[in-house]
């Protein structure tokens, strides 16, 4: 269903002060400037729709230029509780507290929010990424240590008149950026509390949020250059499908990944790429300006629509799933990494997908909207697309029901 509802105050139009408030690049995440404490301490914070904690570096670390100094904030309150977040690779741990938080290039409000002060971490901060913390924008169900810790966005909506919605436009550069270029580059926009029409073209199409934990959606069909992968649609969502700005790649369940790679290989068979390319290990390069985009297929994901038996599709180009990488050894060429990878935790629609689209996280109406991004990288022959409606039956059957256990869910 397209975006044809009556206007609601504060939900539409122009949000000039928030446009271009993100920096970064797909490989190391997109970050927004935030201030914490009194007097305000400025930090760059990774925007992550795949987690639900607001957590910031609060102790010296070799990869951090600055960190949150609680002792300097007159408004800091200690919750006298620790938090430990293990990942499949790495972890962070810290101490919970609350403090006053605002977003300089966001809504003109200050909120008291929960903050995890990271005191120890392993494989969490990234050297050269330029961010010092993470803003988990997903739901309380996956917050650590448990769902009683209110996430930042919930606090924001509760304490202010900001509508319960945010939207993201992540702008991939289309070429590798060195450190100084990243610091100077525009990475996109996080519009808090609304939708900015200047950031997209065409119509917004919405898919239901299946369950409010991650931003879980249902994929009902996958096509490579218009060719259906013809898999049981449950496979596409095994064990879930999520929209995650904190992940670089489009990650697919093993069976789906293998089928997709087989199909992409077949479509691009005019060139013989090494096995290591499909694994994300080897780069492929072409002389500057000669990348044969046309030999690579487009990839379409059909998402459940808002109306029964109706779906819509989002289509990305190789310009989204081939990620430019700078390598001094081959600096005279344009080199790329294959940015689709295998997952054991379901489909993750990371930056590779999001860089093609303006994505609306309409929490108030439990839905996610997609429109073609005004900043997506394309060529003169093809463009990313959001199209519908399509008739698709039995879409509810595409969702996988995860067996309930007491074990923690957030092992990314």
């Amino acid at each position: 269903e397209t975006d044809e509802e009556p206007e609601e105050p504060g939900r539409r139009g122009s949000f000039v002060e928030m446009v271009d408030n993100l920096r970064g690049k797909s490989g190391q995440g997109y970050y927004v400037e935030m201030t914490v404490g009194s007097p305000p301490q400025t930090l760059n914070i990774l925007v992550d729709t795949g987690s639900s904690n607001f957590a910031v570096g609060a102790a010296p670390h070799p990869f951090l230029h600055r960190y949150y100094q609680r002792q300097l904030s007159s408004t800091y309150r200690d919750l006298r509780k620790g938090v430990y977040v293990p990942y499949t690779q790495g972890k962070w741990e810290g101490e919970l507290g609350t403090d006053l938080v605002s977003i300089p290039h966001g809504p003109n409000v200050t909120v008291r929010a929960n903050i995890a002060a990271i005191t120890e971490s392993d494989k969490f901060f990234i050297n050269g990424s330029n961010w010092e913390g993470i803003l988990g924008l997903a739901y309380a169900e996956i917050a650590r240590p448990d769902d009683s810790l209110e996430p930042f966005f919930d606090s924001l909506v509760k304490q202010t008149h900001v509508p319960n919605l945010f939207s993201l436009q992540l702008c991939g550069a289309g070429f590798p950026l060195n450190q100084s270029e990243v610091l100077a580059s525009v990475g996109g926009s996080m519009i808090i509390g609304g939708i900015d029409h200047s950031l997209y073209t065409g119509s917004l199409w919405y898919t239901p949020i299946r369950r409010e934990w991650y931003y879980e959606v249902i994929i009902v069909r996958v096509e490579i250059n218009g060719q259906d992968l013809k898999m049981d649609c449950k496979e596409y969502n095994y064990d879930k499908s999520i929209v995650d700005s904190g992940t670089t790649n489009l990650r697919l369940p093993k069976k789906v990944f293998e089928a997709a790679v087989k199909s992409i290989k077949a479509a691009s068979s005019t060139e013989k790429f090494p096995d290591g390319f499909w694994l994300g290990e080897q780069l492929v390069c072409w002389q500057a300006g000669t990348t044969p985009w046309n030999i690579f297929p487009v990839i379409s994901l059909y998402l459940m629509g808002e109306v029964t038996n109706q779906s819509f599709r989002i289509t990305i180009l190789p310009q989204q799933y081939l990620r430019p990488v700078e390598d001094v050894a081959t600096s005279q060429d344009d080199c790329y990494k294959f940015a689709i990878s295998q997952s054991s935790t379901g489909t993750v629609m990371g930056a590779v997908i999001m860089e093609g689209f303006y994505v609306v996280f309409d929490r108030a109406r439990k839905r996610i909207g997609f429109a073609v991004s005004a900043c997506h990288v394309h060529d003169e022959f093809r463009t990313a697309a959001v199209e519908g409606p399509f008739v698709t039956l039995d879409m509810e059957d595409c969702g996988y029901n995860i067996p309930q256990t007491d074990e923690s869910t957030l092992m990314t």
Epitope: I126, K272, F273, P274, D275, G276, C285, T330, C335
Partner: antibody, heavy 116, light 107 residues
């Protein structure tokens, strides 16, 4: 400037194990996989395996699966190779190399000598 | 595993000459072949990738050619510093494999 700094020479007894290191600098460590290779006089170069520093995913040459274990520490941009149950056949020069297209960058070599 | 064969173990040449070193793959590897130079006591140095592309900083007297199963590294106007062993490598499929090497001797 991209550099791969390998640990120094090792003299080890048969049956023992050894852990070699390779510290990377001059590039974004998590962007490129690290490979390990073996060279013995008259036997050419052999690829042992590789590791992705972004998630510690490993892939090994079947021939070295029971011999080598690769690990990574992103906080120090260092990759390690643990060689177990050493025999005289493991006496060799070992290299780490960084991927890109093939292996554009190599470490300076580590000589391992297995001797009683 | 793909076998990379460098049939000439040694080649003798003179300064200023042109020399071609060959390498044969046991199966089609497309253009996914690299060439390395190794001087005694040193690590290999990358010269050529994708069969014919020079890495940054490699002198243009080194050229690579070939595709499929047959590959050649040509050094034109050989210099005394080119005295070294040269290896080909396929990175088309795992496990990555190398040729046995060709030692270039300067007369």
């Amino acid at each position: 400037e991209v550099q791969l700094q390998q640990s120094g020479p090792e003299l080890v007894k048969p049956g023992a194990s050894v852990k070699l290191s390779c510290k990377a600098s001059g590039y974004t460590f998590t962007n490129f996989w690290i490979h390990w290779l073996k060279q013995r006089p008259g036997q050419g170069l052999e690829w042992i395996g590789m590791i992705d520093p972004s998630d510690s995913y490993t892939k090994y040459n079947q021939k070295f699966k029971a011999k080598a274990t690769l690990t990574v520490d992103t906080s120090s941009s260092t990759t390690y190779m643990h060689l177990s149950s050493l025999t005289s056949e493991d006496s060799a020069v070992y290299y780490c190399a960084r991927s890109g297209v093939a292996f554009p960058y190599w470490g300076q070599r580590t000589l391992v000598t297995v001797s009683a | 595993d793909i076998v990379m064969t460098q049939s000439q173990k040694f080649m003798s040449t003179s300064v200023g000459d042109r020399v071609s070193i060959t390498c044969k793959a046991s199966q089609n590897v497309g253009t996914n072949v690299a060439w390395y130079q190794q001087k005694p006591g040193q690590s290999p140095k990358a010269l050529i990738y994708s069969a014919s592309y020079r890495y940054s900083g490699v002198p243009d007297r080194f050229t690579g050619s070939g595709s499929g199963t047959d590959f050649t590294l040509t050094i034109s106007n050989v210099q005394s510093e080119d005295l070294a062993e040269y290896f080909c490598q396929q990175y088309n499929s795992y496990p990555y494999t190398f040729g046995g090497g060709t030692k270039l001797e300067i007369k």
